[in-house]
Interface confidence: low
């Protein structure tokens, strides 16, 4: 096929004007998989444009996408997950541009959740834990996680730690004392599946302890009530006398 559409306003449009990108999410809704595509140029007039996927499907030759505002979306169990599918932008029966894509190489995991940070006073460290729905999945089970944290006042100075488990220990001495930190986590497929980073989890905020001259720490971190903190500080002052 030529690179030009043959109807009306679109007849001078070049293929490149319709470049798009897609990501898949496997077992995103029970046993259903999803595929989401969008045009890379936000100014494309999408009024009459449709997306269709053909090949590497179970029982059907092709499936049509639903249009949701600016994105195109399919939720189905019909992805074979072996071999490449042909994804086309269509106007009527005419294909404007197509891409051959193996859906297992464009997987975007679901965002991690339940991120929390607990301070261990005896160990002088912070235990970071989070959860991921992928632990229960059949396909995309193995993920690499990217934990990012920063001192709240440092706008762009994020420290990143990559890990394959859902638990991380941050040593207190590596963090600034009496500082508020923001932490978040995202995931990417590892092992057989390939693809993109998930969305970031919601951020979690925690405070590091102050360093006191004699007794070392005060409880000025985490969700501790002001009354307990005041009692603790009185106790520390009495110890100093």
């Amino acid at each position: 096929e030529s690179g030009y559409a043959q109807n009306g306003d679109l007849e001078d449009a070049e293929l490149d004007d319709y470049s798009f990108s897609c990501y898949s999410q496997l077992e995103v809704n029970g046993s259903q998989h999803s595929l989401t595509c969008a045009f890379e140029d936000p100014d494309v007039n999408i009024t009459n444009l449709e997306f269709e996927i053909c090949g590497a499907l179970v029982e059907v030759k092709c499936l049509n996408f639903r249009k949701l505002q600016e994105i195109y979306f399919i939720e189905t169990k019909k992805f074979l997950l072996i071999g490449k599918s042909n994804i086309c932008v269509k106007v009527g029966e005419k294909s404007l541009t197509c891409k051959k894509i193996d859906l297992t190489t464009i997987v975007k995991p679901e965002a991690p959740f339940d991120l929390s940070v607990v301070y261990r006073e005896g160990a002088n460290d912070f235990v970071v834990t989070f959860n991921t729905s992928h632990l229960q999945k059949k396909y995309v089970k193995v993920l690499m996680h990217d934990v990012a944290y920063r001192q709240e006042k440092d706008e762009n100075k994020w420290t990143h730690v990559n890990l394959s488990s859902t638990k991380l220990t941050l040593l207190q001495r590596k963090l600034q004392p009496a500082a508020m930190y923001e932490i978040k986590v995202r995931s990417i497929p590892d092992h057989y599946f390939k693809g993109f980073w998930s969305e970031w989890s919601p951020s979690y905020y925690f405070r590091t302890p102050e360093i006191n001259n004699s007794s070392g720490l005060s409880l000025s971190y985490g969700p501790v009530s002001p009354i307990i903190r005041r009692l603790w500080n009185i106790f520390v002052r009495n110890q100093e006398k």
Epitope: S31, V58, E59, N64, E75, T76, K138
Partner: antibody, heavy 120, light 112 residues
């Protein structure tokens, strides 16, 4: 080839319950749903609901939600429908059918049907 | 619920004739994704239904090309170009666009 083997005919008293089974073979059981359909003698077809065995998610026709419970056993590739508080209105043939993603195939392969007779 | 009305109730035909069955829905069967989930099934005496046509006009695998489906919105038609003895039975239309899924009342195709 795809096959759905349903359990044998049931004779039940009013007020009792019955549990119908539907054993699937010839395809990956957890990759599809199982729908249940009712057909009274000489009458039309009514969709009861659908279960997705992998997740256990169920989707009922509200009309039959209190009448039926859908379950599935992945290890034996078998789906079940329990009918409770039986009345003469429940006397019918019940079919199970493989259902693809809700909006593509609906129900493509069907079991042979199980006859349920409610009589005192 | 979407009501599916089939006509005629009974259709006497001679072998080799063309047969046409109509199905009308109480609301549009065009899904929000642009597809129309209208199906046709054939149920022979003592058997379970078999799918003939999916999404208005697509023949299911193994279905002879004498069967064709057409229509849009709320009005749909199943045509059999040359009726054969094995085509006799009850034909049901079915919609999978709106939950609960619903069937038409059936059309019995019989020999004149």
């Amino acid at each position: 080839q795809v096959q759905l083997q349903q359990s044998g005919a049931e004779l039940a008293r009013p007020g009792a319950s019955v549990k119908l089974s539907c054993k699937a073979s010839g395809y990956t059981f957890t990759s599809y749903g199982i729908s249940w359909v009712k057909q009274r003698t000489g009458q039309g077809l009514e969709w009861f609901g659908e279960i997705y065995p992998r997740s256990g998610n169920t989707y009922y026709n509200e009309k039959f939600k209190v009448k039926a419970t859908l379950t599935a056993d992945k290890s034996s590739s078998t789906a079940y429908m329990e009918l409770r508080s039986l009345t003469s209105e429940d006397s019918a043939v019940y079919f199970c059918a493989r259902s693809g993603p809700p909006y593509y195939y609906a129900m493509d392969y069907w079991g042979q049907g199980t006859s349920v007779t409610v009589s005192s | 619920d979407v009501v599916m009305t089939q006509t005629p109730l009974s259709l006497p035909v001679s072998l080799g004739d063309q047969a046409s069955i109509s199905c009308r829905s109480s609301q549009s069967l065009v899904h929000s994704n642009g597809n129309t989930y209208l199906y046709w099934y054939l149920q022979k005496p003592g058997q379970s239904p078999k799918v003939l046509i999916y999404r208005v006009s697509n023949r299911f695998s193994g279905v002879p090309d004498r069967f064709s489906g057409s229509g849009s919105g709320t009005d749909f038609t199943l045509k059999i170009s040359r009726v054969e003895a094995e085509d006799l039975g009850v034909y049901f239309c079915f919609q999978g666009t709106h939950v609960p899924w619903t069937f038409g009342g059936g059309t019995k195709l019989e020999i004149k």
